[in-house]
């Protein structure tokens, strides 16, 4: 018996299986959303091109007290190489406009759907 | 108890200028980064500048740029909006916030109407 992406799993999660992961963690917020995700909380929108994974971490770890994403920001984490700690934005990382989490969620969840759709797993 | 206690606002012709004040409490001040976020009549919220907790940079949405300047005082733990050049389209409810903590810990809002 496999628990992927759990204690139990033999071996490295395939990137397939860790990207599908992610999408169904951010379907079941979106749905799931009662009141306003994370009291309306508002971070730095990302681009979703190179270093998105970082990136979108770096953006969401600075949210703290927020039950709903922590297990999106620990998946993040396992897409981003380097650790990454609140506070703490990449070159990559252009600050021009905040969004609340919700739409960030649904603008991440969008973009790694077309990724999963072409192949796209790392 | 973290509070943000908002003050300025009111009514303004097309042009004209206001300053909107934030006086926070509560909480290291000097330590953190704060945002003004504006919702408009009938309309989401829309983040409008951000200040780095030693107010050395600044950020602001594209529609206030060149006419907002946020700044900080920490030694009075206080929290500004120079709004200038002010437009209809700058109608709205002003909230300070702590940034990344939602409506927890937000300003009571104070309302900006532009209008002649």
């Known amino acids: 018996l496999t628990c992927l992406g759990g204690f139990a799993s033999p071996g490295p999660v395939p990137p397939s299986t860790a990207l599908r992961e992610l999408i169904e963690e951010l379907v079941n917020i979106t749905q799931n959303q009662k009141a306003p995700l994370c009291n309306g909380s508002m971070v730095w929108s990302i681009n979703l091109t190179a270093g998105m994974y970082c990136a979108a971490l770096e953006s969401l770890i600075n949210v703290s007290g927020c039950s709903a994403i922590e297990k999106t920001q620990r998946m993040l984490s396992g897409f981003c190489p380097h650790k990454v700690s609140a506070g703490q934005f990449s070159s990559l990382h252009v600050r021009d406009t905040k969004i609340e989490v919700a739409q960030f969620v649904k603008d991440l969840l969008l973009h790694l759907k077309k990724l999963f759709r072409e192949g796209q797993f790392n | 108890e973290v509070q943000l206690l908002q003050s300025g606002g009111g009514l303004v012709q097309p042009g004209g200028s206001l300053r909107l004040s934030c006086a926070a409490s509560?909480?290291?001040?000097?330590?953190?980064?704060m945002d003004w976020v504006r919702q408009a009549p009938g309309k989401g919220l829309e983040w409008v500048s951000t200040?780095?907790?030693?107010?050395?940079?600044?950020y602001y949405a594209d529609s206030v740029k060149g006419r907002f300047t946020i700044s900080r005082d920490n030694s009075k733990n206080t929290l500004y909006l120079q709004m200038n050049s002010l437009r209809a389209e700058d109608t709205a409810v002003y909230y300070c916030?702590?940034?990344?903590?939602?409506?927890?810990?937000w300003g009571q809002g104070t309302l900006v109407t532009v209008s002649s």
């Open positions: 916030a702590k940034a990344y903590t939602g409506f927890r810990y």
């Open positions: 509560g909480f290291t001040f000097d330590r953190e980064e």
């Open positions: 200040i780095s907790p030693n107010g050395r940079t600044t």
